[in-house]
């Protein structure tokens, strides 16, 4: 190691950040480059290919300069730099433009989403206090599955205005809980559309809808796909009647036969009579026999 | 340890067209700086071209601006010079380097490959 060499060579101190720079050794990049020259010329180190122990050694230079945190011009103009980022430097940073949170999101592209990335997308919400529309296109844009990652608190801040940013794949990976908070704000965020359209939009939502907006649905002619009937929760479909989950998949409620083994399809045939799901014609199996007694156990418990 | 194989290069008329290839072993030199340089008969090695270990970035010698392009392939372990518009001046062996500290410490350096031009 050569950390003893601490003075400039002569003629070698940085006028500029250039590309001259690339051919110095790590030793005479921390002794011949000033770090407010760094600084105010990082918009130059992302053209220059400075080798990976190099950038070390200006990232140690802005550590330096900055112990409290990075500003904003300089972080926007970070670059390639951003993947040498720790998690503990990111939280230092207030970072507030968008464009700075775009330029940082595209060096890290076609890449999984690092800790350094969450960590900078977590302060920049925060920082913002919403999920705004331009934010989230921004998110779902680079990360499909952006907002799947959330917790249904953190979804609690997206308004529903919010929502018409957000495409079907974008909540492929959600869960229950997750679509149980974004379906309201959906619903919310449509309520002004006319049937057939409303039907598209809310589509991929409808994981999180309640029985009550079930049974609406199936006196529209939505025809709803037994992909997205399969992602209803099963507390929301176990009380539609055989004609309401007719009415609900149209065409498509030929295909229960296929999913009679799986959930919610499963729960639903053992809350049926057998005669109603006979009218089907589809040879479900499992219903209630004729001449039993279904009793509402729920209705006894609330009324106890 | 990185080993780096040149490979593509040959007798080419002035104005011709060549790709050289540079494939690493050893390690993965995705963290790697990866350079051509090239010697000619009776002078100094000089560097041609410079790709960063992001391949987000380059560098060229004022002589070969416009004519020649430097990329690489992180999943392959590979690296590319394409040499346009050839002159005899480019006449040399071409070495493929690779540093993750700087080239003049540190530096990986391939066997060489030669590169002739004819006028």
């Known amino acids: 190691r050569e950390v003893e060499k601490t003075a400039c060579p002569s003629g070698k101190k940085a006028r500029e950040i250039d590309e001259s720079l690339i051919f110095y050794k790590k030793w005479e990049l921390e002794a011949c480059v000033d770090a407010a020259l760094l600084a105010t010329q990082m918009d130059r180190v992302n053209a220059i290919p400075f080798t990976y122990e190099q950038l070390d050694v200006l990232k140690h230079k802005l550590d330096e300069l900055y112990p409290q945190g990075y500003p904003e011009s300089v972080i926007q103009h970070l670059g390639y730099l951003f993947l040498k980022m720790s998690p503990e430097d990111i939280r230092k940073w207030n970072v507030t433009s968008l464009e700075t949170l775009k330029a940082l999101l595209e060096v890290n592209k076609g890449h999984e989403m690092s800790p350094q990335v969450a960590t900078l997308i977590d302060r920049f919400v925060k920082g913002r206090g919403q999920l705004d529309k331009d934010t989230l296109d921004t998110l779902t844009a680079f990360y499909p599955g952006y907002l799947c990652s959330l917790s249904p608190e953190e979804l609690s801040s997206v308004p529903p205005s919010s929502i018409w940013a957000v495409r079907p794949q974008d909540l492929d990976t959600c869960d229950p809980r997750q679509l149980d908070v974004l379906y309201p704000k959906a619903r919310l965020a449509f309520q002004n559309m006319n049937g057939s359209e409303y039907f598209v939009k809310i589509q991929s939502f409808l994981g999180g809808a309640p029985t009550e907006d079930l049974k609406a649905l199936s006196q529209q002619n939505v025809s709803m796909d037994l992909a997205t009937f399969m992602k209803l929760r099963t507390d929301a479909v176990l009380p539609l009647t055989v004609a309401e989950v007719q009415k609900l998949l149209g065409p498509h409620v030929e295909g229960l036969k296929a999913e009679e083994r799986h959930r919610p399809v499963r729960d639903w045939i053992l809350r049926q009579r057998q005669d109603d799901l006979d009218t089907l014609g589809l040879g479900l199996q499992g219903g209630i026999p004729n001449g039993y007694l279904v009793l509402d156990l729920s209705m006894q418990e609330a009324l106890s | 340890q990185v080993q780096l194989v040149e490979s593509g290069g040959g007798l080419v008329q002035a104005g011709g067209s060549l790709r050289l290839s540079c494939a690493a072993s050893?390690?993965?030199?995705?963290?790697?700086?990866m350079a051509w340089f090239r010697q000619a008969p009776g002078k100094e090695r000089e560097i041609v071209a410079v790709?960063?270990?992001?391949?987000?970035?380059?560098y060229y010698a004022e002589s070969v601006k416009g004519r020649f392009t430097i990329s690489r392939d992180n999943p392959k372990n590979t690296v590319y010079l394409q040499m346009n518009s050839l002159k005899p001046e480019d006449t040399a062996v071409y070495y493929c380097?690779?540093?993750?500290?700087?080239?003049?410490?540190?530096?990986?350096w391939g066997q060489g490959t030669q590169v002739t031009v004819s006028s």
């Open positions: 050893g390690r993965t030199v995705s963290t790697y700086n």
């Open positions: 380097a690779a540093t993750r500290t700087s080239w003049t410490e540190n530096t990986y």
């Open positions: 790709i960063n270990w992001t391949g987000g970035s380059t």
